[in-house]
Structure formats: structure tokens, C-alpha cells
């Protein structure tokens, strides 16, 4: 266990050309906040998967009026850390957004409004227990200064947080192969090598080998779930280690209460103990204002103070959804045209085109035969992005340079012989049969299954085909 | 300075219904979020319907199921439907308009609700 310290130094412009405008005015002046989210890993998530290390929200600023004409400086920042407590081991390395909210304190009659100004992210890897990180962000226009670290909670230590210190037995030293904890060096170190298979969510050790539960959980390795009703067993009440099992099902089985809501038993039945922003007997009712800040990617919320009062964001481009969570995916509307990859950049639409297309939306087809010869009397026929060569009798090939074979394809059926000849191929036909390709059988009487034969031609003589 | 326009407010009986227009005829509401607040005497405003600019729609608990807020953006008009009313409901409605760069408002228009 833990915390993550997050310490803001200053918002202000970036240095550069483009000043922003003061986000405050005399007509309306605001103040900052800040919240942070923090993620396990190395992952670029989006902005609005969940915060698995934790969140914090910072404390509001002083009230900030801009100066006419005056070119907007730092801005007035609020006190204090934003410290974002862990329960488990430090990962080491992890992701983090930081965004910037502007509180209006103008004559907002619904309440005050709140909109992101700035939202900044990174993925770094940082151990704990060591010295401040700091950091320069930008965003836009904006320029956020920042400094981190990660502290383990006692009795942990160590760079994950995930070694306890005990007092020392001995006054003298640690026992064997057990250091001192830096930088208490009147404690040891303790080894822990908890017991094969104890339940990493549900258990944990303060000696070598042993398995303790967290409340709620029991067994030898704590996988079995435990009610907190009293034991009817001569064990007498549960407790976190030794727990015991009481049939049948508990009020809390399947956890009645909604949105994250987290049940206890009562005597007579259950409670739900509601997260921020949701009421209820099961917590099903959104109890969700502005004031807590639901939009996501830069929404500009808008609503009552009053928890009756419904709320809303206004999305910025490329999001939709009640709290601007969902990402617009535009290429499924296809836009790009002829086979053309579409690539959503957030701020705009791209599309990558085909060899023979162009266009914003590869709408423009090319043409494809300019420049483009076709040989020996071949015509070019465009199509589909890409030329295609129609080749004069006796040649083929992409572009007509290959002169063709005219048997290759073994054009005479029932076993006539194929002759090349310069005007095309002639088919010399098996006995029986006939035609330019000796695709008709001749009648065992002499008779033709044609009209009468050319004249000049008998039946079984050589078929020209042109 | 551009305001919004309401219209459709009245006596109506309880349990009976009313539509509401907001309308503008200097601003495009299509890319805006527009909502009813309601106002009743001794009270603060309260955001009862609102369409965002990508046309989600959120209620306050007190009209969920009972009022539906729509815009036809030909007519550059937003629309409450108030059903099942109650005397509760009675109040001044306020057409609200806005986007990142700044927010409109109606004068109001009365919608009383008889027992």
C-alpha cells in the first residue's frame, strides 16, 4: 500500500507565439482544478477506460478575474497535493492523464459551469520510495509544470511497496539473511513468501508461510467467501482468519446495489452504501451533477446544482454520448470512396487512396491510361484504378508485347489438332467431327448436324477458324 | 443580444399535456445544447430536459417518463412534450441554449398546472 503525490507547480501559456486567451474574464471570472487519473502499465488507454490505480480530484483555486488586455499569466492554483492512495503493490510503470478544469463563477442561474481547459498524459516508470519527478506537459497552448512520486505506506517498503518492515528482535541485528529497512535502520526487513496458493486479491502475510484473510474471505488460502452474520458454530463469530461458512443465501449474494454500490447486511436485510453521485435504495438513482465533473474529452457540462437537476455535456468534435465518452467512430460511415482507407485523426478525417483514385475522399478517378502505351496495336481500357491493355489478335500480356500463342489454350475439342496460323488457328478435327473448333459431331450417314458444309469444305477437312 | 423565443405555455388541468417551442431565428440550434430549466416561485432553476449538440437527452427525476424533449432542425425549433402533468410542475420554463463559446436564454414562458 501506498500514495501517489502529485504536486502542480504552474498552468500557464507555452512559450512560443499563439498566447492563449485568459480562460477567466471580468464578465466571468473562474477558478482551476485539477484531476488526475492514474493507470497500471504502459498502456495508451483511451481517456475514458477506467482509472485502475486511482483517481484524485484537486481542491478549487483562488478566484482568478483577467486584467483587460493583459495577456493571460499562470493562473492562480489551488493548495495542497492531489494524493491518490493505493491499496496494492506500486507497478513501477504506469500511465497518468492529468486534466486542467475551469470552474465559471459567473451568473450561471442553473449553477456554475465547468469546462476541461487542458488535458495532458504520459506513461512513465517510476519507483517508489524515491525522490520527486518533475515534469513539463504541453497541451495546445497551455503548459502544465509537475512534480511526482510514489511513497509506500508503513509497515511497506521497497520499490513496489510490497516488503514490511518489522521492529528489530534482537537489538544487535537482523536474523539471518534479513536486512535492515532503509531508511529504518532499527527495523528488518520481513521475508514475504506467503503460503503456496494464498489468494492474492483476498489474502496476505505478515510471517513467511502463513495466510491471513481480508474480512469477507476464509479458508485456508482465503477463496471461500464468508457471510458476516454470526457463526451458529462453538467457533462463535467469524473472524478474517479463521471465518466460517454459514449456508444458505445472504441478503448481499449477487450484490443488490448498482452502480458500484457496495452492500452490507443488516439485521433485517441489507444497505447499500452509494458511490458519489448515485442514491437510492440500491443506488440506482444517478444523483450525477456538474459538480462532478462527468464529462469526458473536453465536454462542457451543462446542468443544475440541484441533485433533481438533469445534466449534460456538450461534446467537442469526434465525441458523442451523454458524457462525451464515446469516440465517433467516422469510418463506419465509409466516407472514403473506390476503395480508399479511412483514418480517423481525431481532429480530422483522412483518406488513403488507391492507386488511380485521389480526392479528399478518393472521389477522383485518374486516368488510368494516360501516359500509358499499349503495344502492337492493343487499346488501353481504364477501370477500377488501375489500366488494362485490350491486345490486338495474336498478343497478350499486361501490355501486349508478348505475342500469342493461339493453342496454348487448346482450343480444338474431341481430339483435333491445332495448327498457328497468321489470321488465328485452325483446327484439323478427328474423324467424326467438324466445325471451326470440331465441336460437332458429322451423322454416321454422311449427313452434318449443319446446313450443308461450305463449299469447298468436306466433312473431316480442316477448319479454318478466323 | 439573441434571444431565444418560447411559446406553448398555459392553464392546463392536471394530468393533461402541453408542448413548449424554442425557437431562434439568429443562432443554429442544431450544434447546440438546448434545455428547459423551470423556475417555480421561491425556487432555484432547475435543468428539467436537455438535447446535447450530438443528441443525447438526459431528464430530471421528478420528469423522467413523463416529459421528451426533440428538435427539428429544419424549423430550427426544440420542442418540450409535457404529459401526465402536475400541479408541481407549475413554473416558468426557460429555453437555454449553448455551446463552447457562450450560452442563450429565453424570457419564459408560464405553465400552470391545476389540482
Known amino acids: 500500500a501506498g500514495v501517489f503525490e502529485l504536486q502542480i507547480h504552474s498552468f500557464g501559456p507555452g512559450p512560443g507565439p499563439g498566447a492563449p486567451r485568459s480562460p477567466c474574464s471580468a464578465r466571468l471570472p473562474c477558478r482551476l482544478f485539477f484531476r488526475v487519473c492514474l493507470k497500471p502499465g504502459l498502456s495508451e488507454e483511451a481517456a475514458e477506460s477506467p482509472c485502475a490505480l486511482g483517481a484524485a480530484l484537486s481542491a478549487r483555486g483562488p478566484v482568478y478575474t483577467e486584467q483587460p488586455g493583459a495577456p493571460a499569466p499562470d493562473l492562480p492554483l489551488p493548495d495542497g497535493l492531489l494524493q491518490v492512495p493505493f491499496r496494492d503493490a506500486w507497478p513501477g510503470t504506469f500511465s497518468f492523464i492529468i486534466e486542467t478544469w475551469r470552474e465559471e463563477l459567473g451568473d450561471q442561474i442553473g449553477g456554475p459551469a465547468w469546462s476541461l481547459l487542458a488535458r495532458v498524459a504520459g506513461r512513465r516508470r517510476l519507483a517508489a520510495g524515491g525522490p520527486w519527478a518533475r515534469d513539463i506537459q504541453r497541451a495546445g497552448a497551455w503548459e502544465l509544470r509537475f512534480s511526482y512520486r510514489a511513497r509506500c505506506e508503513p509497515p511497506a517498503v521497497g520499490t513496489a511497496c510490497t516488503r514490511l518492515c518489522r521492529p528489530r528482535s534482537a537489538p544487535s541485528r537482523c536474523g539471518p539473511g534479513l536486512r535492515p529497512c532503509a531508511p529504518l535502520e532499527d527495523e528488518c526487513e520481513a521475508p514475504l513468501v506467503c503460503r503456496a496458493g494464498c489468494s492474492p486479491e483476498h489474502g496476505f502475510c505478515e510471517q513467511p508461510g502463513e495466510c491471513r484473510c481480508l474480512e469477507g474471505w476464509t479458508g485456508p488460502l482465503c477463496t471461500v467467501p464468508v457471510s458476516t452474520s454470526s457463526c451458529l458454530s462453538p467457533r462463535g463469530p467469524s473472524s478474517a482468519t479463521t471465518g466460517c461458512l454459514v449456508p444458505g443465501p445472504g441478503p448481499c449474494d449477487g450484490n443488490p446495489c448498482a452502480n458500484g454500490g457496495s452492500c452490507s447486511e443488516t439485521p433485517r436485510s441489507f444497505e447499500c452504501t452509494c458511490p458519489r453521485g448515485f442514491y437510492g435504495l440500491r443506488c440506482e438513482v444517478s444523483g450525477v451533477t456538474c459538480a462532478d465533473g462527468p464529462c469526458f474529452n473536453g465536454g462542457l457540462c451543462v446542468g443544475g446544482a440541484d441533485p433533481d437537476s438533469a445534466y449534460i455535456c456538450h461534446c467537442p468534435p469526434g465525441f458523442q454520448g451523454s458524457n462525451c465518452e464515446k469516440r465517433v467512430d467516422r469510418c463506419s460511415l465509409q466516407p472514403c470512396r473506390n476503395g480508399g482507407l479511412c483514418l480517423d485523426l481525431g481532429h480530422a478525417l483522412r483518406c488513403r487512396c488507391r492507386a488511380g483514385f485521389a480526392g479528399p475522399r478518393c472521389e477522383h478517378d485518374l486516368d488510368d491510361c494516360a501516359g500509358r502505351a499499349c503495344a502492337n496495336g492493343g487499346t488501353c481500357v481504364e477501370g477500377g484504378g488501375a489500366h488494362r491493355c485490350s491486345c490486338a489478335l495474336g498478343f497478350g500480356g499486361r501490355d501486349c508485347r508478348e505475342r500469342a500463342d493461339p493453342c496454348a489454350a487448346r482450343p480444338c475439342a474431341h481430339g483435333g489438332r491445332c495448327y498457328a496460323h497468321f489470321s488465328g488457328l485452325v483446327c484439323a478435327c478427328a474423324p467424326g467431327y467438324m466445325g471451326a473448333r470440331c465441336e460437332f459431331p458429322v451423322h454416321p450417314d454422311g449427313a452434318s448436324a449443319l446446313p450443308a458444309a461450305p463449299p469447298g469444305l468436306r466433312p473431316g477437312d480442316p477448319q479454318r477458324y478466323l | 443580444q439573441v434571444t431565444l423565443r418560447e411559446s406553448g405555455g398555459g392553464l392546463v388541468q392536471a394530468g393533461g399535456s402541453l408542448r413548449l417551442s424554442c425557437g431562434a431565428s439568429e443562432i443554429t440550434l442544431s450544434d447546440k445544447t438546448v434545455g428547459w430549466y423551470r423556475q417555480a416561485p421561491g425556487k432555484q432553476r432547475v435543468l428539467v430536459a436537455v438535447?446535447?449538440?450530438?443528441?443525447?437527452?438526459n431528464y430530471a427525476h421528478s420528469v423522467k417518463g413523463r416529459f421528451t424533449i426533440s428538435r427539428d432542425n429544419a424549423k430550427n425549433t426544440v420542442y418540450l412534450q409535457m404529459n401526465s402533468l402536475k400541479p408541481e410542475d407549475t413554473a416558468v420554463y426557460y429555453c437555454?441554449?449553448?455551446?463552447?463559446?457562450?450560452?442563450?436564454w429565453g424570457q419564459g414562458t408560464l405553465v400552470t398546472v391545476k389540482p
Open positions: 438535447i446535447s449538440n450530438v443528441d443525447s437527452t
Open positions: 437555454y441554449a449553448r455551446d463552447f463559446e457562450a450560452e442563450y
